[in-house]
């Protein structure tokens, strides 16, 4: 598989936003790349979000996606929003070179994202 690198650990902000870079070593000159973020928890793997982009163009997730991102060469900067403590888990970056053939696939080792829910503000008298 292709080599895919991502940070081991990221701490989400108090607003439930986590960002990390997913970098892949492309064997050649792909023009169409698909990036998928997967969440692994208790051996269950679920898709968080996915985007296909043309090299040199912006990364576009669906409008209702909790992910946003930008791309630069073989690097993708991913941001996941709306995270809560229960979303703490291992987030895996999957990269596929879709075009031109051949197809290449790479899976990162995962980024452990820790999310801490903010303490509610105390009522002021």
């Amino acid at each position: 598989a292709m080599h895919v690198a991502q940070p081991a650990v990221v701490l989400a902000s108090s607003r439930g936003i986590a960002s990390f870079v997913c970098e892949y070593a492309s064997p050649g000159k792909a023009t169409e790349v698909r990036v998928t973020v997967l969440r692994q928890a208790d051996s269950q793997v679920t898709e968080v979000c996915a985007a296909t982009y043309m090299m040199g163009n912006e990364l576009t997730f669906l409008d209702d996606s909790i992910c946003t991102g930008t791309s630069s060469g073989n690097q993708v900067n991913l941001t996941i929003q709306g995270l809560r403590a229960m979303d703490t888990g291992l987030y895996i970056c999957k990269v596929e070179l879709m075009y031109p053939p051949p197809y290449y696939l790479g899976i990162g080792n995962g980024t452990q994202i820790y999310v801490i829910d903010p303490e509610p503000c105390p009522d002021s008298d």
Partner: antibody
């Protein structure tokens, strides 16, 4: 048009050696990982070896059945990949295909190992 | 190495039938699965890559599905020219092994 043309097959005695070649054209050879796959008579497809390209430091991988006996190599200046096959056994008989990361395939070359 | 279990080993169906072939892997391969068609005396032909993507020039009768460890190749309406042996292959591993094959015949 993409083309992969294997050559070098033939009859070889058990314990002998043979070298297969695969000449590629119609795509950017140096951008791709190259593989050898075989099909023995009455058997299924068997992946044998892979050589990656320059960004991957030409890493090589082998199936357990050929490791230590077969060597894959490539010459990007000649758009060619090779399979050096040593210590051949009768069970190595089959049609050998080269493939550019399984998207493009050659027509195959027959290797027969027999005394 | 990742083990590939393909079933059935052979299959006989009628023209127009919907045909499914399955492939199970010994561990999660994250959709890194290809399907091939091989006709006697011909080179293997890539049908589906990345579990669900139709290769260029392949009839839309063919489709792939699945994730994790379970994958399926479906032929929506079997045609006489589909007689062949079909193989799955794990492309995630550095040792990209094939399934044992499914020989498809027409009744």
């Amino acid at each position: 048009e993409v083309q992969l043309v294997e050559s070098g097959g033939g009859l070889v005695q058990p314990g002998g050696s043979i070298r297969l070649s695969c000449a590629a054209s119609g795509f950017t050879f140096s951008d791709n990982w190259m593989n050898w796959v075989r099909q023995a008579p009455g058997k299924g497809l068997e992946w044998l070896a892979q050589i990656r390209n320059k960004p991957y430091n030409y890493e090589t991988y082998y199936s357990a059945s050929v490791k230590g006996r077969f060597t894959i190599s490539r010459d990007d200046s000649k758009n060619s990949v090779y399979l050096q096959m040593n210590s051949l056994k009768t069970e190595d008989t089959g049609v050998y295909y080269c493939t550019a990361q399984f998207a493009y395939w050659g027509q195959g070359t027959l290797v027969t190992v027999s005394s | 190495d990742i083990q590939m279990t393909q079933s059935p080993s052979s299959l006989s169906a009628s023209v127009g039938d919907r045909v499914t072939i399955t492939c199970r892997t010994s561990e999660n391969i994250y959709g890194g699965l290809n399907w091939y068609q091989r006709k006697p005396g011909k080179s293997p032909k890539l049908l589906i890559y990345g579990a669900t993507n139709l290769a260029s020039g392949v009839s839309s009768r063919f489709s792939g599905s699945g994730s994790g460890t379970d994958y399926t190749l479906t032929i929506s309406s079997l045609q006489p020219e589909d007689v062949a042996t079909y193989y799955c292959q794990n492309v995630l591993s550095s040792r990209p092994g094939f399934g044992s094959g499914t020989k498809l015949e027409i009744k």
